[in-house]
């Protein structure tokens, strides 16, 4: 096989190599049915692999390593990331603003009304930010024909059974153009179980309208599926920019707040929480976290929900208790204990169970000291010290942050400890504070933790 693997030859099975080759042929410069697109340097397997690694923000090695294979094995949309379906003619966008859709058949996993509601809501995502209108037809030919099918279902792009490829849609154009197909070997739901039909449909309809995949992990048009929570869906800014570049803005956007993916080198970047996790550093911002390995400069960006689906989208504070292999995550008046990917039974708990007074609405930052077994909890302009060993709040607390750590300001957004120094984050600034000399030794931009 023409795919070089990283490291030892016995790293990857023959099955993995064949899977990776199929993946790259499907999603990176797929050849057309007649095989007219001959393999050339640009579409060789190594080149495709490099493109795929670049697309997902992985280290571009041109070698198949476990990080790359992990990404390949995640559930995703069947539309190519680079290159396009070559069987059917396409246009850049629809030349009209009034489009029709028809639900040709239904999945047995949901009621008809649930399916109809999911599709209606998915179209509304796009009509809310553009002049587009969508009308449902009950028979005949619509611009966007929606159907559920399994394996080979009539378009030469077969589905693959449970998980893997979830759905695909064709770009604007005649015949198959605009049509959206959903793999009925998946379990479709209107919740976080199985695959959420609304979320997948909203993504696929983006393709039906002419959008390609986005490299932004926070975008709806990112190719990999992540359930983003029960609360009101807000179309990310990246998708709004994309669709409005094709169709322009609508008259009135009912949800004018469109979440942006944080830029790690933005000089005004402030952070929500920082914790170590089994030797790595997790840096939380909005719905995301950066995962920084000690030997790497490039941090990987993830949606928090892709790691921990049961957690809220945004968190306030976090700390690790390494000897127990646990991390604690705070949001509002609740906190969670996590072992790796798993939430411990009995959580979330109320922060008042730690001995905090009822008027404390949230913890803004937290840091644990393994040598003493103590954890500092920051809220507003105050700090508490919790004894993790005896599960009791220390006497003489709370104290004023300004008194215990003079010079760092009267609030803490995020904090972590390393080699006898505490790093306090306050807005776009971080303070390196020496535990031994009890003073600030350096002031740096917050994003220097991300090698900016």
């Amino acid at each position: 096989l023409p795919l070089p693997s990283g490291g030892d030859e016995d790293d990857l099975s023959e099955e993995d190599l064949q899977f990776a080759e199929r993946y790259l042929r499907s999603y990176y410069h797929p050849t057309n049915l007649a095989g007219i697109l001959k393999e050339n340097a640009a579409s060789s397997m190594t080149e495709r692999l490099r493109e795929m690694q670049s697309f997902f923000g992985l280290e571009v090695t041109g070698k198949l390593d476990d990080n790359t294979l992990d990404v390949m094995k995640k559930p995703r949309c069947g539309v190519p990331d680079v290159g396009e379906y070559n069987v059917f003619p396409r246009t850049l966008k629809w030349s009209k603003m009034n489009l029709t859709y028809r639900i040709v058949n239904y999945t047995p996993d949901m009621t008809h009304s649930e399916v109809e509601k999911a599709f209606k809501k998915a179209f509304k995502v796009w009509s809310d930010v553009t002049p587009l209108n969508f009308t449902r037809l009950h028979d005949g030919i619509a611009d966007i024909m929606i159907s559920f099918g399994i394996k080979e279902h009539g378009d030469f792009y077969p589905f693959d059974g449970p998980s893997g490829l979830l759905a695909h849609a064709f770009p604007p154009g005649p015949n198959y153009g605009g049509d959206a197909h959903f793999d009925d070997d998946e379990t479709w739901t209107s919740s976080s179980k199985g695959y959420n039909l609304f979320l997948v449909a909203a993504h696929e309809f983006g393709h039906s309208l002419g959008l390609d995949h986005s490299k932004d992990p926070g975008a709806l048009m990112f190719p990999i599926y992540t359930y983003t929570g029960k609360s009101h869906f807000m179309l990310p800014d990246d998708d709004v920019q994309g669709i409005q570049s094709l169709y322009g803005p609508g008259d009135e956007d009912p949800n004018p707040k469109h979440p942006k993916t944080p830029d790690k080198c933005d000089p005004s970047l402030s952070l929500d929480a920082i914790t170590s996790l089994r030797g790595e550093t997790m840096i939380f911002k909005d719905r995301f976290f950066w995962r920084l390995h000690p030997q790497q400069v490039d941090a990987e960006l993830f949606l928090t929900k892709s790691f921990w689906p049961e957690l809220p989208n945004r968190i306030d504070a976090a700390y690790e208790h390494p000897s127990h292999d646990l991390i604690f995550i705070f949001r509002g008046r609740k906190f969670w204990a996590l072992n790796g990917y798993d939430i411990l039974e009995g959580y979330p708990k109320k922060i008042s169970e730690l001995g905090l007074p009822k008027e404390v609405k949230k913890i803004s930052a937290a840091v644990h000291f393994e040598d003493t077994g103590k954890t500092l909890l920051f809220s507003g302009n105050q700090v508490w010290r919790y004894d993790d060993t005896n599960h009791i709040m220390d006497k003489d607390y709370p104290r004023l942050i300004e008194e215990d750590f003079p010079g760092i300001g009267d609030k803490v957004d995020a904090v972590y400890e390393k080699n006898g120094y505490i790093y306090f984050f306050n807005g776009p600034i971080q303070f390196e504070y020496s535990i031994w000399s009890n003073r600030i030794v350096r002031v740096m931009p917050a994003n220097s933790i991300l090698w900016c």
């Epitope: 476990d66 990080n67 992990d70 094995k73 995640k74 559930p75 992540t226 993830f302 892709s306 790691f307 689906p309 292999d325 646990l326 072992n339 790796g340 990917y341 798993d342 411990l344 039974e345």
Partner: nanobody, 114 residues
Framework: EVQLVESGGGSVQAGGSLRLSCAAS????????MNWYRQAPRKQREFVAG???????HYAVSVKGRFTISRDNAEGTGYLQMNSLKPEDTAVYYC????????WGLGTLVTVSS
């Protein structure tokens, strides 16, 4: 509740490779994260590698780049491919599904000699 059985342990020279398997029976394996822990003589049990239901992997810093965790949900099996083994990797390796409060296997011994 998932029942787990590890296999694939044994003795190997430093620099060699082993592939551990973890066969799951009982309830649906795909619903649980899958982790490997290890315990060396007179030491605390430590996390080695984990893979979530969404196939996101996580490694202890000491094994990253040498060990690869994977899972086959259809077969109900988890794997740990261990390359470039070192004497300090000697330990009993335990398979886990669902985290500390989840299910554990009985372990398989890995001995790496110099």
């Amino acid at each position: 509740e998932v029942q787990l059985v590890e296999s694939g342990g044994g003795s190997v020279q430093a620099g060699g490779s082993l592939r551990l398997s973890c066969a799951a029976s009982g309830s649906t394996f795909s619903r649980y994260s899958m982790n490997w822990y290890r315990q060396a003589p007179r030491k605390q049990r430590e996390f080695v590698a984990g893979i979530s239901t969404a196939r996101i992997t996580h490694y202890a810093v000491s094994v990253k780049g040498r060990f690869t965790i994977s899972r086959d949900n259809a077969e109900g099996t988890g794997y740990l491919q261990m390359n470039s083994l070192k004497p300090e990797d000697t330990a009993v390796y335990y398979c886990n599904a669902g985290g500390l409060q989840g299910s554990w296997g009985l372990g398989t011994l890995v001995t790496v000699s110099s």
